[in-house]
């Protein structure tokens, strides 16, 4: 009796694990084994697929094969007993394209009202994601064990801290990875649960703000109790993305170590151009608070978020406003390479009734204006990142008269 070729071959790739599954064509025939060959693009010869020869089950693992994951390969399978079936060819595929991101590893630390989540790729030193290690982002779902109401948090990196939790409460979460550059979404990790601790005697400092005065940064915060000492630490924000290393080398700001006031002043040259995280801790000599919420601090934005510059093209019933980069001394434009939102305020020159438009685009239409009427416009920029939460001052008002009727085209 002729052996039939196996059918329905599935290739599952998760991280660096390559698994093949298939269906037996004839369940009635016993003691059948299966073997695979593979062929690389541009090659004529077929090579035996190690790990997938003379297999008695309908599953095999060929992870040990060192493939170029970006190179297309073709597989074929046949059944063997005394004789062999014809080969069944599997559609060719590129491992990287087919690969799924496996569940990440999750490590949790508990405080009284916060949980620190450290996330690592599920496969250490993965070949599949070797070029994408720093591109992983993660999303998580968290819920109180007692309620089950889920909250989703998107676009986090390998270290994330969730605040404003309840003490002595068990929280559960699961995490998945994504490679947005390759449109890949991974599978969720197992569920991890952790209980927050009893409430700490000392609360962490709150409402941390940075401002600029002369050549100094002024860091201010609020605290519940008097007669405390505080310390401030900083970390390069990009270090939160480091997938393999969970040793975060927070650094002391020398002028903000053991300060007895709820502010500290330090020279701007302490920080080179960049984005940093800042955190503050309180101590009464015996006890210490947990660290405050970490605030993001961008030296560029902090130093100078300039008001936008804009031109107005007047029509009969609208203004078209074109927003450009602000100018610095010498009339050179300032390159602000972070996303901004523009707030545009406009009013009829003879009235105090202001109207507001919020836009992400740099070309904005102000609609519903009256012809031959003078309107004034001013604008300011806001950073789009709610953690930075910076705004420029308003630009000077520019007043223009709308055109006569029927010129809206």
């Amino acid at each position: 009796k002729n052996l039939k070729s196996p059918q329905k071959v599935e290739v599952d790739i998760i991280d660096d694990n390559f698994i093949l599954r298939w269906n037996r064509s004839d369940e009635s025939v016993g003691n059948v084994t299966f073997s695979f060959d593979y062929q690389k693009t541009g090659m004529d010869n077929w090579i035996k697929l190690s790990g997938c020869q003379n297999i008695t089950s309908t599953k095999c693992n060929f992870s040990s094969l060192k493939l170029n994951v970006y190179e297309e390969i073709k597989l074929r399978i046949r059944a063997e007993k005394e004789n062999t079936s014809s080969w069944y060819e599997v559609d060719s595929f590129t491992p990287f394209r087919k690969a799924q991101i496996g569940p990440p590893e999750v490590h949790l630390e508990a405080e009284d009202k916060a949980i620190v989540i450290h996330i690592s790729p599920g496969t250490k030193d993965s070949v599949m994601w070797a070029l994408d290690g720093l591109s992983f982002t993660y999303s998580l779902v968290i819920w109180k064990n007692s309620s089950g109401v889920e909250e989703r948090i998107e676009n986090i990196y390998s270290r994330h801290k969730i605040y404003k939790l309840s003490p002595e409460t068990t929280y559960c979460l699961k995490v998945k990875a994504a490679l947005l550059t390759s449109w890949k979404i991974g599978v969720y990790s197992p569920v991890h649960c952790i209980k927050t601790t009893v409430e700490n005697e000392l609360p962490p400092p709150e409402n941390i703000e940075v401002s600029v005065q002369n050549q100094n940064y002024v860091l201010k915060w609020d605290y519940t109790y008097a007669n405390m000492t505080f310390q401030v630490q900083w970390l390069h924000a990009f270090l939160k993305r480091n997938p393999g290393n969970h040793l975060y080398k927070w650094k002391q700001i020398p002028d903000c170590e053991n300060v007895k006031t709820t502010q500290c002043v330090f020279p701007q040259n302490v920080f080179q151009k960049g984005i940093y995280l800042l955190r503050v801790q309180a101590s009464d000599g015996n006890n210490t608070s947990f660290w405050s919420e970490e605030i993001k601090f961008d030296t560029e934005i902090q130093a100078f978020l300039l008001p936008p510059v804009f031109n107005i093209r007047s029509l009969s019933d609208s203004f078209h406003i074109y927003i450009g980069a602000p100018k610095q001394s010498g009339n050179t434009p300032v390159i602000q390479d972070y996303p901004l939102i523009y707030e545009i305020i406009f009013w009829e020159n003879t009235s105090n009734a202001e109207r507001k438009i919020i836009e992400k685009k740099t070309d904005v239409t102000v609609p519903n204006l009256k012809p031959l009427t003078v309107y004034c416009v001013k604008a300011r920029a806001h950073t789009m990142d709610e953690k930075l939460n910076k705004s420029s001052v308003f630009s000077d008002a520019v007043c223009e008269k709308t055109k006569p009727g029927n010129t809206s085209k």
Epitope: E109, A110, N200, N245, L247, T288, F290
Partner: antibody
Framework: EVQLQQFGAELVKPGASVKLSCTAS????????MHWVKQRTEQGLEWIGR????????KYAPKFQVKATITADTSSNTAYLHFSSLTSEDTAVYYC???????????WGQGTTLTVSS | DIVMTQSQKFMSTSVGDRVSVTCKAS??????VAWYQQKPGQSPKALIY???YRYSGVPDRFTGSGSGTDFTLTISNVQSEDLAEYFC?????????FGGGTKLEIK
């Protein structure tokens, strides 16, 4: 394989100074913290301090602030503990330890036995 | 400084038993606690970090638990090779501090 190589023993006179070394292999000390821990016979463990070899930043336990100086040489992948004005109280085993992920002490050297005696 | 107290200096147990070594912190340290094992004549070896995470290669009979101020290292099915001293340590605030140690004796 991660290893922290320390010399077995040092014998020094009271009032003198000593510099203990710890040479790491299997990892780059710049990527970690390097700590020093003291253990006297039949006693517990005392944290002396640590260094960030990447930039030389140090932290010390108040008790050792004056007596101890921790340094590192990244070119030889070595951390050092300099102990000054030695007394019999400084007789102990000194361990160098790697501060790894989440700040924990994941690898310990075999220790150097320092004996201060005239 | 945070004081880590291991109230039992010695504990006696038999092979196959389950034993719990406790450690109390003088203030809330979250889950920032590690446990180390030191066998006679050897340097300490890391067992547990972040209160409950086992280092790779550490037998699963060693389990860490606790948060806030109270922490426990449990050894189930004690083996003769577990004869050692066990230290807890807080890693949340400088100076890092250790407990005084608990010596496990095998009957």
């Amino acid at each position: 394989e991660v290893q922290l190589q320390q010399f077995g023993a040092e014998l020094v006179k009271p009032g003198a100074s000593v510099k203990l070394s710890c040479t790491a292999s299997g990892f780059n000390i710049k990527d970690y913290y390097m700590h020093w821990v003291k253990q006297r016979t039949e006693q517990g463990l005392e944290w002396i301090g640590r260094i960030d070899p990447e930039d030389g930043e140090t932290k010390y336990a108040p008790k050792f602030q004056v007596k101890a100086t921790i340094t590192a040489d990244t070119s030889s992948n070595t951390a050092y503990l300099h102990f000054s004005s030695l007394t019999s109280e400084d007789t102990a085993v000194y361990y160098c330890v790697r501060g790894g992920n989440f700040y924990y002490f994941d690898y310990w050297g075999q220790g150097t036995t320092l004996t201060v005696s005239s | 400084d945070i004081v880590m107290t291991q109230s039992q200096k010695f504990m006696s147990t038999s092979v196959g038993d389950r034993v719990s070594v406790t450690c109390k912190a003088s203030q809330n340290v979250g889950t920032n606690v590690a446990w180390y094992q030191q066998k006679p004549g050897q340097s300490p070896k890391a067992l547990i970090y972040s209160a409950s995470y086992r280092y790779s290669g550490v037998p699963d009979r060693f389990t860490g638990s606790g948060s806030g101020t109270d922490f426990t290292l449990t050894i189930s099915n004690v083996q003769s090779e577990d004869l050692a001293e066990y230290f807890c340590q807080q890693c949340i605030n400088y100076p890092y501090t250790f407990g005084g140690g608990t010596k496990l004796e095998i009957k």
